[in-house]
């Protein structure tokens, strides 16, 4: 079974080389009962969702824009 | 057809066991989450448990932990829920839920898109 | 545990009128969240999920939206089929929750 439905994970797998440009939001979900990784959630301009690696430099600092531009709103 | 068929409710005295049964057909059943929600007569829905696709992790609500125990035979796509030590309060319609939602090959969301016709639990004496 | 708090919980409307529905969750749940449709005496249908996404094979008058704690389900122009009770629920986090349900009645 997958990480996603052995758990209640909703990242099978993350994936690699998005543009932060094609991305409108994103969520971060931590550890819990329902799944014991982090899990980064990103809803692209298109609409559809992507998960991201939460280890990846790129990745973090996506978060990191995303939390600073929340924040200066 | 994707389909799920209750069974093994009815009548119990309080402090009674009962095991409920969901037979499942029309999908490749080890794949999904199952889940159970209960409504009482003339209530919401509430969510009781929920089990994942090997069986190896299940999710109880506070109000039935340590009382009921929910468990998957995936060779016979059988879903079960085992309820000892039963209340009053816990008389209700008693629904099986899969949980679907494969969105992106690398996002999943737990929808329960398909259900039982439910079977009813009476707790009285 | 997640709260899921459903307004109103009746509501009475005509067939050709437009309703919304809202649902508010006590911590930000993202769009995690999905709207049932139950029916008397039947097991409840899946009309949303994620939020915004229209389940298939359901009527484009029905929409959802929101994100975070604050989500609202629409139907565009009433029809006799829609008279029910509609609930929403959170899968962010187990216990998954339910609101309490809003009834549409036919005024």
């Known amino acids: 079974a997958s990480v996603a439905t052995e758990l209640r994970c909703q990242c099978l797998q993350t994936l690699q080389g998005i543009h932060p440009k094609n991305i409108q939001s994103v969520n971060v979900k931590s550890p819990g009962p329902h799944c014991a990784q982090t899990e980064v959630i990103a809803t692209l301009k298109n609409g559809r969702k992507a998960c991201l690696n939460p280890a990846s430099p790129i990745v973090k600092k996506i978060i990191e824009k995303m939390l600073n531009s929340d924040k200066s709103n | 057809e994707v389909q799920l068929l209750e069974s093994g409710g009815g009548l119990v005295q309080p402090g009674g066991s009962l095991r409920l049964s969901c037979a499942a057909s029309g999908f490749t059943f080890s794949e999904l989450s199952m889940s159970w929600v209960r409504q009482a007569p003339g209530k919401g829905l509430e969510w009781v448990s929920a089990i994942s696709g090997s069986g190896g992790s299940t999710y109880y609500a506070s109000s039935v932990k340590g009382r009921f125990t929910i468990s998957r035979d995936n060779s016979k796509n059988t879903l079960y829920l085992q309820m000892n030590s039963l209340r009053a309060e816990d008389t209700a319609v008693y629904y099986c839920?899969?949980?679907?939602?494969?969105?992106?090959?690398?996002?999943?969301?737990?929808?329960?898109?398909?259900w039982g016709q439910g079977t009813p639990v009476t707790v009285s004496s | 545990d997640i709260q899921m708090t459903q307004s109103p919980s009746s509501l009475s409307a005509s067939v050709g009128d437009r309703v919304t529905i809202t649902c508010r969750a006590s911590q930000s749940i993202s769009d995690n969240l999905h709207w049932y449709q139950q029916k008397p005496g039947k097991a409840p249908k899946l009309l949303i999920y994620?939020?915004?996404n229209l389940e298939s094979g359901v009527p484009s008058r029905f929409s959802g939206s929101g994100s975070g704690t604050d989500f609202t389900l629409t139907i565009n122009s009433l029809q006799p089929e829609d008279f029910a009770t509609y609930y929403c629920?959170?899968?962010?986090?187990?216990?998954?929750?339910f609101g309490q349900g809003t009834k549409l009645e036919i005024k």
């Open positions: 629920q959170q899968y962010y986090s187990t216990p998954l929750t």
């Open positions: 994620d939020a915004s």
């Open positions: 839920a899969r949980e679907g939602g494969r969105l992106e090959p690398y996002y999943y969301y737990y929808a329960m898109d398909v």
